[in-house]
Amino acid sequence: MAQWNQLQQLDTRYLEQLHQLYSDSFPMELRQFLAPWIESQDWAYAASKESHATLVFHNLLGEIDQQYSRFLQESNVLYQHNLRRIKQFLQSRYLEKPMEIARIVARCLWEESRLLQTAATAAQQGGQANHPTAAVVTEKQQMLEQHLQDVRKRVQDLEQKMKVVENLQDDFDFNYKTLKSQGDMQDLNGNNQSVTRQKMQQLEQMLTALDQMRRSIVSELAGLLSAMEYVQKTLTDEELADWKRRQQIACIGGPPNICLDRLENWITSLAESQLQTRQQIKKLEELQQKVSYKGDPIVQHRPMLEERIVELFRNLMKSAFVVERQPCMPMHPDRPLVIKTGVQFTTKVRLLVKFPELNYQLKIKVCIDKDSGDVAALRGSRKFNILGTNTKVMNMEESNNGSLSAEFKHLTLREQRCGNGGRANCDASLIVTEELHLITFETEVYHQGLKIDLETHSLPVVVISNICQMPNAWASILWYNMLTNNPKNVNFFTKPPIGTWDQVAEVLSWQFSSTTKRGLSIEQLTTLAEKLLGPGVNYSGCQITWAKFCKENMAGKGFSFWVWLDNIIDLVKKYILALWNEGYIMGFISKERERAILSTKPPGTFLLRFSESSKEGGVTFTWVEKDISGKTQIQSVEPYTKQQLNNMSFAEIIMGYKIMDATNILVSPLVYLYPDIPKEEAFGKYCRPESQEHPEADPGSAAPYLKTKFICVTPTTCSNTIDLPMSPRTLDSLMQFGNNGEGAEPSAGGQFESLTFDMELTSECATSPM
C-alpha cells in the first residue's frame, strides 16, 4: 500500500503530527494529488545533486499539468484552481533553487515513514500508551496460556496414573506376600501345582504391567519436565524480560508498563504444577522402597528427575523475585533511579509466586553495591550506607491486589566519608553522575524442605549530593535505559555506547509526553536533530555519542544540548504547561522554517518558540509585521525566562504585549496565533479577569483605588532591524479607568498625556539575548 494511503488510516493523534509536517512551502494538496509519483522519486539524491534536482522539479511541474488536465475533464473547478495556484507558487519559489524543494519533500517523506513506524510500534505494544494495564493478549501469550494449561492437564493425568500404579503395586504386593506366606511357591506338589503355576504367571504378568506403568510414568515425567522447562523459559526469558524492558522504558518516560498480575498468575500456576510434580517424584521413591526389582526404572531415573524439578523450581523462584517499583524519591516521581543523599526514597519488591503459605515468611534485606568489591571499574567510586528501615517482611496485606510484596518507604543513602573527600580513592575515572550503583534485595525461602536464596536488584541508580546534579544524573539514566537491557552493567559509562537519532528522538519525546499531555511532533524533533547533528535531510540512523548528547557544549554555546533541553522541559512543566498541552507552543522550530511559515501569513500572526541561546530555558514569540514601505518583517521578542514568568504568566504577557512606536503609541503586534487562532481565543481563558486582580478597595478610603495593570512593552524605532530580538520592558503602572486603559495614547486626553511621559520603565523582562 502506498505510504500516503497508510498515513490516512492512522489515529487522529498521528494525523495531527502529519498536519504539522505540511505548510505552504510544500502544500498537502500537492502531496495528496501526486502521491504515487512523489513516492516513486529519489528526493534525497535530488537534494544533494543540483542537476538531478532540476530534472525532478521540471518533471514535478509536468505531473501537475497532467493532473490539472484530469481535473479539467472532471470539471473539478476547486481542484483546478488549487493546482494552478500551487504551480505558480512552486515556480516563483523554487525555479532558481530546485534543491530546496527536493530537500523539503525528502524530509517530509522521511518524517512520514517515521510516523508510520511509531504508530506500528504503538500498535504492537497493544495500545499500552492508552491502556497501561489493559489485558491485551498477544498470539504468543495465548500460546503460553495453552502450554500452561497443557502442563496443568499433564500433571493431573499423572496424578491419576500415580494412583493407578499405586493400586496395581499394592495388589501385586498383596498377591506376592499372600503366595509367599502360604508357602505356595515351594509347594508345587499334587493338585496345587497347576493352580500355583497359574497364580505365578498372573503375578509375573502383574509385575510386567507394573514395570510398564512405571516406565510410562517416568517417561511422562521427563516429558512434562521438558514442557515445564519450555514454558519457564518463555515466561522468564521472554515475558518477564519484556516486562523488565518495559519497566526500563516506563522509568524514562515511555509508555506505562503493564501490570504484573497476569505474569504472576502464570508463574504461580507453573510453580504449583512444579511442586505437585515434585510430590509425584517423591511418591515414586516411596513406591520404589515398597517394591523394587531388577531394571526398576524408578531406581534408574528418579534421582535425575528430582534434580531437574528442584532446579526448575529454584530458578523459577529466583526469577520471580522482582523489583516492582524502582527506587524513586517521592518528590521526583517522574525521575526515578536518581537518589539524593539524605533524601528519602521508596522502592518495592514482589515475589511473583503467590503462595499463601509464604505470607509473612520472607524477610527482605536491602543493601547497596553488594558486589562492588568485585568490580574493577568501580575503583574510585563513592561508597554508601543505606539508612532507615532496611529490612521488611513480605506480606499480602499491604498491596491492594494481594500480591506478595514488600514496600520500603523510608530509605536514605549516606555517603561513607573517606579521607580524600568522599571518593574511595583518587583515580576515579567517572564523574559522580556517571557512577552507577545497585540496590540489592535479599531473602531466603524455606519451602517443602528446600532452602532457596533469593536476590534481585534495582536498575542502576545515580546518587547525587546536590539537586543541581539532577539534570546530568537524569541524562545518565536516560542513556543507560535507552541503550541497554543489561540490568546491572555498572561499568556502562566507562565506555558509553552510541545511540541513534531514532532512539534519542523517541526518548526526548517521552520527556514531554510523560509529564505533559503532549509529546514532540516530527517537526519539533527534526529541529532538535538539527541542533544535535547539524543540517541534514534524513537523520534516521545518525549516530549520537554520549558526549554530544550531554557533555560537550553545542556549537557556539556555553552549554550542552541536554542542559538546554532539560531547562526547557522544566520551563514547560512549571510555567507554560497549559499552553503546551493545548499545542499552542511550536517550541522547537528553526529560524528558516519560522520565516518560511510566517512570511506568507497576514501581519499580526505570531508563534511561540523556545530560545536557542538561553541556557536556563526561555520562551519567545515571533510575529509578522509590515514596515512603513509595506515590506513583510519577522520580529522576535527577547526570550522570557523562568525569572520573569514567576512574576507574570506567559498568557498574560502575550495578551498584554505592546510595541511603543516612534510616536509613543502603544500597539499590540500579536493578533493571531499561527496559523489563524485569534489571540483572545487561545490565551484569554488563561488570564485572570481584571475584576479579580484587585477585588477590594480599601474600605477606609473615600474613592476607590485606580486599577493598575502590568504589561510588557517594546520601545521601537524606525531603525529597528529585521529579526533582531526586541527587548521587552514592563510598563509598570498603566492606569486604567473602565476599559480605556489598554489603548492609552498621548492624544487620548490630558490626564493620559502626562501619564505616558511619567511611565516608569522597569528593568528588562529578559536579560539573555536570543
Epitope: V164, V165, N167, D171, F174, N175, M206
Partner: nanobody
Framework: DVQLVESGGGSVQAGDSLRLSCVAS?????MGWFRQAPGKEREGVAA????????HYTDSVKGRFSISRDYVKNAVYLQMNTVKPEDAAMYYC??????????????????????WGQGTLVTVSS
C-alpha cells in the same frame, strides 16, 4: 475415567462356545461381566479381583463360564462354554477401582463407582 471396549459377541448355537474380550484404558482392581436380556434387569455374571486372583460367578454360569485377566493388556475375558438359550443377552464389561468384587458387586449392592462398556450382543439359537 476408565474407558471399556467389548468385543467377541455374536450368534452361536446352543451348546457351543464363545469368548468375549474387554480392554480397559487403564488398570483397575476389579473387572467383570454383567448381562441384560430384553425385558429383564441387568445381572452380574462373573468378576475377577486383582487380589488373590479369585473369580466370582453367578450360580447359573458356574462350571460353564470362566473369567480371566491379562494385566499387561488391561484386558478381561469371559470364556462361555456350553451356551444355553437363556444366556442370550447384551453383555456389558464393567470395572471398578477398588479390588473388592465378590458377590456384593455382582449383586450390584457394593458401594463405589462402576465404569461400563457399551455392550456386546450374544444371541443363542436352539
Amino acid at each position: 475415567d476408565v474407558q471399556l471396549v467389548e468385543s467377541g459377541g455374536g450368534s452361536v448355537q446352543a451348546g457351543d462356545s464363545l469368548r468375549l474380550s474387554c480392554v480397559a484404558s487403564t488398570y483397575t482392581g476389579c473387572m467383570g461381566w454383567f448381562r441384560q436380556a430384553p425385558g429383564k434387569e441387568r445381572e452380574g455374571v462373573a468378576a475377577l479381583s486383582s487380589r488373590g486372583f479369585a473369580g466370582h460367578y453367578t450360580d447359573s454360569v458356574k462350571g460353564r463360564f470362566s473369567i480371566s485377566r491379562d494385566y499387561v493388556k488391561n484386558a478381561v475375558y469371559l470364556q462361555m462354554n456350553t451356551v444355553k438359550p437363556e444366556d442370550a443377552a447384551m453383555y456389558y464389561c464393567a470395572a471398578r477401582e477398588g479390588w473388592e468384587c465378590g458377590e456384593t458387586w455382582l449383586d450390584r449392592t457394593a458401594g463405589g463407582h462402576t465404569y461400563w462398556g457399551q455392550g456386546t450382543l450374544v444371541t443363542v439359537s436352539s
